[in-house]
């Protein structure tokens, strides 16, 4: 194929790939008609003047995962057709000025995972057609004003995983076409007011894993097209009342891993497209009425691993589309009987690892579609008669690690568990804690003839008893169990070529993969 170097493979489609540790310089002669060249996993340490001079038709050049630490300014001369250039995963500490001069067609420039210490305005001043610039995984400590001023067509800029401690409010001011800005995993402590004002087309802003303590009230007021806002794992202790007021397109907001102590009513809104709200690992102690009332389309609400001890009866007003509610690992002792009444579409609720001592008989009265309830590791001694009777879709109920009191009052719960076992999976069985003669015995095989009589008046059901397992064709004898798994964080894992990889560690919220988005 017009002379293919022995160290490379060349395909009919004008694609050349050169790989291997034995390669220490750009192989020659490269076929003059090559349109794509990949130099991967070699021991090349430098690029000299014009190694690609004779392949002027080149459109894509990937020089990745090498030992490359030095590049001559004229290394890419004569590549006027080049649209895609990747120098990712090398050992570059400095970029020569003028390195990208003449690359008039360049649209994607990947410089990620190197050791770059600084960038200057002159580096990219010739790249007026650039749409994508990847600088994540370097050692950048600051971005000088004007660094991106000539990149007016840029749509994607990744500055994540650097050492940025502050951002100038002017650095992004000319990037009116930018759609994705990633600043995750830096050392930012605050973002100056006006920093994002010029980003009127921004759709994704990733600020997670910084040290941001305060958000300016109007920080996002010009970003009306923002769809994904990642603020997790920072030091945010409070949210200014109007900070999220101008984000009508937002469909994903992550705030987990911060220091939020309270949420004021109306803080989230109006966000008609928000589907998921992640608030776990904060210091929230209570939820007031109507705190989420603007989130009419919310489907996933994660409030686990906080310090919530009080939920106002109207806290979840407006969440008529909610499917998943995670309240586990908080300090709840009691719940109002009406607190979930508005959640008509709720499917999964996790209440484990709290201090719940009892549940009102009507707690799930209007939540007829519940499929999974997690109540393990609370202080429950019994449950009200009929509490689950109307839940025809329930297929996972976790009750273990509670101090069940196995007197005669436990019989309705024991019977319900026994008669409904085909629908409830094979999780750990609840065990009696008292009285002493049955401690440690499985609640569902205690000898009912020696069960201690109750010493208190049995609780009257709060609503009429209905068959918990009605004899109708719509309720089969066995139900396939879709065991809920646990999800730690929303997808914020980026790969910067073509796809976003989903890599979740599922330990915070019980949810199916399909439902987790």
């Amino acid at each position: 194929y017009h002379g293919c170097p022995s160290e490379c493979t060349c395909s009919r489609a004008s694609q050349v790939e050169c790989t291997g540790a034995r390669i220490v310089a750009v192989p020659t002669p490269l076929p003059w008609n090559a349109m794509s060249l990949q130099i991967l996993n070699t021991h090349i340490t430098e690029l000299n003047e014009s190694p690609f001079l004779n392949i002027s038709a080149l459109i894509a050049l990937r020089i990745e995962k090498n030992e490359l630490s030095r590049i001559t300014p004229g290394a890419f001369r004569n590549l006027g057709s080049l649209r895609y250039l990747s120098l990712a995963n090398n050992k570059l500490q400095v970029l020569p000025i003028g390195l990208f001069q003449g690359l008039d067609s360049l649209e994607s420039l990947l410089l990620s995972s190197n050791q770059l210490l600084q960038i200057q305005p002159a580096h990219f001043s010739q790249c007026s057609n650039l749409k994508e610039l990847q600088l994540h995984g370097n050692h950048l400590e600051y971005i000088p004003d004007g660094a991106f001023d000539h990149l007016v067509g840029l749509t994607k800029l990744n500055l994540g995983k650097n050492s940025l401690t502050h951002i100038s409010p002017r650095v992004f001011q000319h990037l009116g076409n930018l759609q994705v800005l990633r600043l995750y995993e830096n050392r930012l402590t605050d973002i100056p007011m006006g920093t994002f004002d010029g980003l009127v087309n921004l759709q994704e802003l990733a600020l997670q894993q910084n040290q941001i303590g305060l958000l300016s009230p109007g920080l996002f007021h010009n970003n009306h097209n923002l769809q994904r806002l990642y603020l997790s794992n920072n030091h945010i202790s409070q949210l200014p009342p109007s900070v999220f007021m101008q984000l009508p397109q937002l469909n994903r907001l992550t705030l987990f891993g911060n220091s939020l102590k309270e949420l004021s009513p109306g803080i989230f809104g109006p966000m008609p497209n928000l589907r998921e709200l992640w608030l776990y690992d904060n210091h929230i102690s209570s939820l007031p009425d109507n705190v989420f009332s603007n989130l009419r389309q919310l489907q996933v609400l994660i409030l686990s691993r906080n310090q919530i001890s009080f939920i106002s009866p109207g806290a979840f007003n407006g969440l008529t589309e909610l499917r998943e509610l995670s309240l586990h690992t908080n300090a709840l002792q009691d719940l109002d009987g009406n607190v979930f009444r508005m959640l008509a579409n709720l499917q999964n609720i996790s209440l484990q690892n709290n201090r719940l001592r009892q549940l009102p008989g009507n707690i799930f009265a209007n939540v007829n579609g519940l499929m999974a309830i997690q109540l393990q590791n609370n202080q429950l001694e019994n449950l009200p008669l009929g509490i689950f009777d109307h839940l025809g879709k329930l297929c996972e109920l976790r009750l273990y690690d509670n101090p069940w009191r196995c007197d005669s009052d436990i019989l309705p719960l024991r019977n319900w568990l026994l008669l409904n076992q085909p629908r409830l999976g094979t999780d750990t069985v609840p065990v009696c804690f008292s009285p002493a003669n049955v401690r440690g015995q499985s609640l569902i095989i205690i000898n009912v003839n020696v069960a201690v009589p109750s010493v208190h008046v049995p609780e009257v059901p709060s609503y009429p008893e209905t068959p918990w397992y009605p004899d109708t064709p719509s309720y089969p004898d066995t139900t396939s169990v879709s065991s809920t798994t646990e999800l730690t964080s929303p997808v914020e894992d980026y790969t910067d070529l073509t796809t976003i990889q989903v890599t979740d560690d599922r330990s915070v919220w019980g949810m199916t993969q399909a439902q987790s988005g």
Epitope: G386, S408, L411, N415, Q421, T426, V448, P467
Partner: antibody, heavy 113, light 111 residues
Framework: QVQLVQSGAEVKKPGASVKVSCKAS????????IHWVRQAPGQGLEWMGY??????KYNERFRGRVTMTRDTSTSTVYMELSSLRSEDTAVYYC????????WGQGTLVTVSS | DIVMTQSPDSLAVSLGERATINCRAS??????????MNWYQQKPGQPPKLLIY???NQGSGVPDRFSGSGSGTDFTLTISSLQAEDVAVYYC?????????FGGGTKVEIK
Amino acid sequence: QVQLVQSGAEVKKPGASVKVSCKASGYTFTSFVIHWVRQAPGQGLEWMGYIYNDGTKYNERFRGRVTMTRDTSTSTVYMELSSLRSEDTAVYYCARDYYFDYWGQGTLVTVSS
Amino acid sequence: DIVMTQSPDSLAVSLGERATINCRASESVDYYGISFMNWYQQKPGQPPKLLIYAASNQGSGVPDRFSGSGSGTDFTLTISSLQAEDVAVYYCQQSKEVPYTFGGGTKVEIK
């Protein structure tokens, strides 16, 4: 002590219905399931269904022919079997709890023309 | 439906000797780590009596010579020292899922 006392023997013609009662005493009536099991002469045991808190679950083999009801005021459970045929001749038992820990003495139902 | 198969159909054992009855389910009767297998004794002209529930738990007033074991699909009822009053038909039953089904019975007699 726990007791389940059933109604007396019945002789029925094919196509008729029979209603057998089971009166419970010695325990909290509403706290336990009542099952019905039948045993044809010289044969094994066959579960028919249960009733608990007005919820019922029937063996598909009897669906449409069996109805179980209860009267909490008298702590009595009833099992009615309709469209009787000769192969329904059997002793019918009520039994308490999920694990069938106490049984009635049985009611012989004979279906014969 | 889960089919319960008992063996043997009948068993003759000398007084004081061990009697063993087996029961196999067509699928596992385990749930929650518990085997929902029960054993009943029926003497002529009497209703059945609960001996063992959940595979190995003795019913109220059942003599210690009766014990149950097994898990999954294979279960055993053992009478450690047969007494004259143990002459009866013994049934296994699964209560894992509806319809609850019984084995065909094993008749135990004195040799």
